[in-house]
C-alpha cells in the first residue's frame, strides 16, 4: 500500500526557510552588539531540531527549549510593547522609539516573523507543500507552539509599566483568543508589573469615540485587575500623527490629544 504524506490545511513551509532563518540571524547579530556571541549555525540547528522528524501536530514547548536557551536575550523589562492585530504600527513605533521593544525586535521573534514551517514524522524533510492550520488541523503545530513559547517568555520578563497596542477597528478590540489574550496577559508577573497600559488605535479619521469604554476593553481591565495589576487605557485617534509626534516630540501640534 503506498504511503501518502498527510495533507494539511495550511500553507507549506515558507520558501527558502533555512536560508532565511540563517540570514536573519547573521543580520541580527551584526546589528545588535549584545548578541554578537551567538553562533547562527547552532541557532539554525536548534531551530530545526525543534520540529524536524516530529509529527507537526505533536510539538511541545520542550522541543523549543534548546533554541530558547541559545536565543536568551535581555531586553529592558520596563520597555516592552505588546500588540494584538496591529503588528505593522507596533513595529513602526519601535523603529522610531528605539528604546522600546516588541517581541519581533528580539532575536527569536525576528527570526520567525511572518514565516511558516513544519516537518514530518520520522523523516528529515521540511514540508514545503502544507503545514497544519491552527483551527482546521491542530493547535500544537510548530509555528503556534513557537509563538506561544516566545510570547510567554517575553511577557514573563516584563516589569513596571507594560504597553499594549490594540486595533480599534476590529470587532473584538481585545480578543481572548489572540496570543496577547490567551498567553501574554496571563503571564505578566504581578510582583513585577505595576500597570498594563492599553493604546487603542483608531482606524477612521472621524472616529472620536472613546474606545476605552468598549466592552472587550472592560473585559481586559477585569482580567488584569483580578491579577493585581493596574490597568490604564488611551485612545490613539490619529495613528499617523502619533507616529509623527514620536519622531518629533517638540512639534507644536504634538501637545494636543492624538
Amino acid at each position: 500500500v503506498p504511503r501518502w504524506r498527510q495533507q494539511w490545511s495550511g500553507p507549506g513551509t515558507t520558501k527558502r526557510f533555512p536560508e532565511t532563518v540563517l540570514a536573519r540571524c547573521v543580520k541580527y547579530t551584526e546589528i545588535h552588539p549584545e548578541m554578537r556571541h551567538v553562533d547562527c549555525q547552532s541557532v539554525w540547528d536548534a531551530f530545526k531540531g525543534a520540529f524536524i522528524s516530529k509529527h507537526p501536530c505533536n510539538i511541545t514547548e520542550e522541543d523549543y527549549q534548546p533554541l530558547m536557551k541559545l536565543g536568551t536575550q535581555t531586553v529592558p523589562c520596563n520597555k516592552i510593547l505588546l500588540w494584538s492585530r496591529i503588528k505593522d504600527l507596533a513595529h513602526q513605533f519601535t523603529q522610531v522609539q528605539r528604546d522600546m521593544f516588541t517581541l519581533e525586535d528580539t532575536l527569536l521573534g525576528y527570526l520567525a516573523d511572518d514565516l511558516t514551517w513544519c516537518g514530518e514524522f520520522n523523516t528529515s524533510k521540511i514540508n514545503y507543500q502544507s503545514c497544519p492550520d491552527w483551527r482546521k488541523d491542530c493547535s500544537n503545530n510548530p509555528v503556534s507552539v513557537f509563538w506561544k513559547t516566545v510570547s510567554r517568555r517575553f511577557a514573563e520578563a516584563a516589569c513596571d509599566v507594560v504597553h499594549v497596542m490594540l486595533n480599534g477597528s476590529r470587532s473584538k478590540i481585545f480578543d481572548k483568543n489572540s496570543t496577547f489574550g490567551s498567553v501574554e496577559v496571563h503571564n505578566l508577573q504581578p510582583e513585577k508589573v505595576q500597570t498594563l497600559e492599553a493604546w487603542v488605535i483608531h482606524g477612521g479619521r472621524e472616529d472620536s469615540r472613546d474606545l476605552c469604554q468598549d466592552p472587550t476593553i472592560k473585559e481586559l481591565e477585569s482580567i488584569i485587575s483580578k491579577r493585581n495589576i493596574q490597568f490604564s487605557c488611551k485612545n490613539i485617534y490619529r495613528p499617523d500623527k502619533f507616529l509623527q509626534c514620536v519622531k518629533n516630540p517638540e512639534d507644536s501640534s504634538c501637545t494636543s490629544e492624538i
Epitope: 504511503r3 501518502w4 504524506r5 495533507q7 500553507p11 527558502r16 528529515s124 521540511i126
Partner: antibody, heavy 122, light 112 residues
C-alpha cells in the same frame, strides 16, 4: 479517474506569445491539495519544470527562474482548466509542453496531459 | 540552482537487475524527496517512485528507490528486467523554494 486534455497551436512565431490550455476532468482546479503544473521537454534541455498554480485560501503561482519574467500560469475556475502563457518566445522555446497534476501528498506529478509539440519558427 | 546528474544510458539483459543513479550537485539529497519517472517513446512520463522509495499502486514491486547520503545520490533499481522496462528514466527533486528540477534522463536498453 483524473485526466488532463491539452490544446493550443503547434506553431508560434518568434517574439510572439505561446498559449496553451489544459482542461481538467475528475478533479478541480480549485482543489485545496493539488497543484497544476506546466513542464516542457526538448532534446537540448530535457524535462524542464516551468511553473504551477494552486489554491490555498487564495491563488498562488510559482515559476522557474529561467522563465519567470515571461510566464503566466492562470486558473480558470468556470471552465475547470488552467493555461500557460509564455511571452517573447524564441526558437529555444521549441519543445513538447505538458500539463501535469501534483496531487499534494507527494512532491511529484501523478497525472500528465498528452503533450503538445510547439515549434517556434517564422 | 542545483542539478541532478544521471548517466545517459545503461543496458542490461532480461531477468537481471539494473541500478540508475541520480546525483545532486548541491544541497543534501536526504533533505528533499526524490521521484522517478518512466517515459516510453512518444508517451508522457509516468511516475514509478515518489517520496524516495514509495511505489504508486499499479507499479510492480520490481521497481525500488533508495537514497545514499554518502554519495549525495538517489537510485532507481529495477530487478527481474523485462523488455517492457525499456524506456527513459528521469529523477526529479526540489529545493527550499519548492522549484522542481529533473535529471537529464537515462535511456535503459534491455538487451536481447
Amino acid at each position: 479517474q483524473v485526466q488532463l486534455q491539452q490544446s493550443g497551436p503547434g506553431l508560434v512565431k518568434p517574439s510572439q506569445t505561446l498559449s496553451l490550455t489544459c482542461v481538467i476532468s475528475g478533479d478541480s482546479v480549485s482543489s485545496n491539495s493539488a497543484a497544476w503544473n506546466w513542464i516542457r521537454q526538448s532534446p537540448s534541455r530535457g524535462l524542464e519544470w516551468l511553473g504551477r498554480t494552486y489554491y490555498r485560501s487564495k491563488w498562488h503561482n510559482d515559476y522557474a527562474v529561467s522563465v519567470e519574467s515571461r510566464i503566466i500560469v492562470n486558473p480558470d475556475t468556470s471552465k475547470n482548466q488552467f493555461s500557460l502563457q509564455l511571452n517573447s518566445v524564441t526558437p529555444e522555446d521549441t519543445a513538447v509542453y505538458y500539463c501535469a497534476r501534483d496531487p499534494g501528498y507527494f512532491y511529484g506529478l501523478d497525472v500528465w496531459g498528452q503533450g503538445t509539440m510547439v515549434t517556434v519558427s517564422s | 540552482n542545483f542539478m541532478l546528474t544521471q548517466p545517459h544510458s545503461v543496458s542490461e539483459s532480461p531477468g537481471k537487475t539494473v541500478t540508475i543513479p541520480c546525483t545532486r550537485s548541491s544541497g543534501t539529497i536526504a533533505d528533499y524527496y526524490v521521484q522517478w519517472y518512466q517515459q516510453r517513446p512518444d508517451s508522457s512520463p509516468i511516475i514509478v517512485i515518489y517520496d524516495d522509495n514509495q511505489r504508486p499502486s499499479g507499479v510492480p514491486d520490481r521497481f525500488s528507490g533508495s537514497i545514499d547520503s554518502s554519495s549525495n545520490s538517489a537510485s532507481l533499481t529495477i530487478s527481474g528486467l523485462k523488455t517492457e522496462d525499456e524506456a527513459a528514466y528521469y529523477c526529479q527533486s526540489y529545493d527550499s523554494t519548492n522549484h522542481w528540477v529533473f535529471g537529464g534522463g537515462t535511456k535503459l536498453t534491455v538487451l536481447g
